[in-house]
């Protein structure tokens, strides 16, 4: 590429984490070129015998692609002459997690960045009124976590209440054999409250939340992954 | 100091089983890919296998696909090679070395085991 | 796979000989390509990797050369301590595969 010096060209990674069996984004942003021929866009994992993918010439490369990444990779080509490097990974693995590294070769010079991808499954909670339940029962499920989480309760009125001892969890294991459906109960819940149903690994945080009036019985959900952090 | 100490060498009746074992101390064994290679007597070098840092892939040679398994278990620092349906062709002396950390970045088979004898003969 | 052959098999040379040893690939390996040095009894001593780059601490009157598919190992002059055999390792697909060897021998 005649790259007079070698000139060193920053390069930005995010890290992230990928739900398994669904596609997945490694984030990897550079100084863009003006010329999509002069970019040369390398992903790497650490330890392993091929390359993740190539990006030349304005097309892929994947001569040296490992067995392991075969048909589950693709760069956004549109957006790589604007500094975007990102790699879509598609049905990720839990074999998928390690340290990546995006090296970017360019007319201006070359560079890298490492990120740390952390694999497992989470997903939304729903919390719901058990009406089959002898007393007042909320339930709570997510059908897909991996590692297994930890399950809190917590509530609005009491708020610093410990209800570990008014509520029952349960881990399934689903059809795959890895991740696993949650299901927590929690008992003798009071109407005109709020309660909070948290699921958290080392991966993901997610919070259901269900009020219970006499009227009425309102829901919000919501998921945070931990540790993103460029 | 990088330290690679292979076990589980021995002598084998044809169609038996031999697990051999590499034990890894003195570098993060989990950011390196791992190898398999060994040497018949008086004979050069052969690349049997190698499995990825993560253990998630695993690559073979073609004289021993589909008898041989390469394994790891990073959180005992030791890779494994389970022999099955084993040959007198398979008498060597196996060695286990460090593969790569990075494609096309990184040196690899930079550090080598002293190797372990598989002898195998009715 | 990628098969790689190395000539000579062997040859006889005196100490502070030049020393060249080849070795061709079956395809185009880019530049993965190792050298690796045996002396009887111990196990190989990697020297040269990616074609060209010098192992630390490995001497250097060792050098290597080439890319695709031929390659070559350069022994400037040639030490006691380097009679031994020498074996080219291509790394360029997921197999890696050794030359058949090259025994360097005192004349």
């Known amino acids: 590429f005649g790259i007079s010096g070698r000139h060193s060209i920053t390069v930005t990674t995010v890290a992230s984490a990928g739900n398994i069996g669904e596609d997945g984004i490694l984030s990897c942003t550079f100084e863009p070129d003006i010329k999509l021929s002069d970019i040369v866009i390398q992903w790497l994992k650490e330890g392993v015998l091929g390359l993740v993918h190539e990006f030349k010439e304005g097309k892929d490369e994947l001569s040296e692609q490992d067995e392991m990444f075969r048909g589950r990779t693709a760069v956004f080509a549109d957006q790589v002459i604007v500094g975007n490097a990102s790699l879509r990974l598609k049905n990720v693995q839990l074999t998928d997690a390690g340290t990546y590294k995006c090296y970017i070769i360019t007319s201006k010079g070359k560079g890298n960045a490492n990120l740390e991808y952390k694999t497992g499954a989470f997903s939304m909670p729903e919390v719901n009124v058990d009406y089959n339940a002898s007393s007042e029962t909320l339930r709570c499920e997510a059908p897909r976590w991996f590692p297994q989480p930890t399950v809190v309760w917590a509530s609005q009125v009491d708020q610093g209440a410990n209800f570990s001892e008014v509520s029952n969890t349960s881990f399934e294991l689903n059809s795959e054999n890895v991740t696993m459906k949650v299901v927590s109960v929690l008992y003798n819940v009071t109407i005109n409250n709020t309660y909070s149903c948290m699921i958290e690994n080392d991966i993901a945080k997610a919070t259901g939340d269900i009020k219970v009036t006499e009227s009425e019985i309102k829901r919000r959900s919501h998921l945070q992954l931990l540790n993103s952090k460029a | 100091e990088v330290q690679l100490l292979e076990s589980g060498g021995g002598l084998v009746q044809p169609g038996g089983s031999l697990r051999l074992s590499c034990a890894a101390s003195?570098?993060?064994?989990?950011?390196?890919?791992m190898s398999w290679v060994r040497q018949a007597p008086g004979k050069g070098l052969e690349w049997v296998s190698a499995?990825?840092?993560?253990?998630?892939?695993?690559y073979y040679a073609d004289s021993v696909k589909g008898r041989f398994t390469i394994s790891r278990d990073n959180s005992k620092n030791t890779l494994y090679l389970q022999m099955n349906s084993l040959r007198a062709e398979d008498t060597a002396v196996y060695y286990c070395?460090?593969?790569?950390?990075?494609?096309?970045?990184?040196?690899?088979?930079?550090?080598w085991g002293q190797g372990t004898l598989v002898t195998v003969s009715s | 796979d990628i098969q790689m052959t190395q000539s000579p098999s062997s040859l006889s040379a005196s100490v502070g000989d030049r020393v060249t040893i080849t070795c061709r690939a079956s395809q185009s390996t880019r530049s993965w390509l190792a050298w690796l040095q045996q002396k009887p009894g111990k196990a190989p001593k990697l020297l040269i990797y990616k074609a060209s780059s010098l192992e630390s601490g490995v001497p250097s009157r060792f050098s290597g050369s080439g890319s695709g598919t031929d390659f070559t190992l350069t022994i400037s002059s040639l030490q006691p301590e380097d009679f031994a055999t020498y074996y080219c390792?291509?790394?360029?697909?997921?197999?890696?595969?050794f030359g058949q060897g090259t025994k360097v021998e005192i004349k």
């Open positions: 390792q291509q790394y360029g697909s997921y197999s890696r595969t």
């Open positions: 499995i990825s840092g993560g253990g998630g892939s695993t």
């Open positions: 070395a460090r593969d790569i950390q990075w494609f096309g970045e990184s040196t690899l088979f930079d550090y």
């Open positions: 003195g570098f993060t064994f989990s950011s390196y890919a």
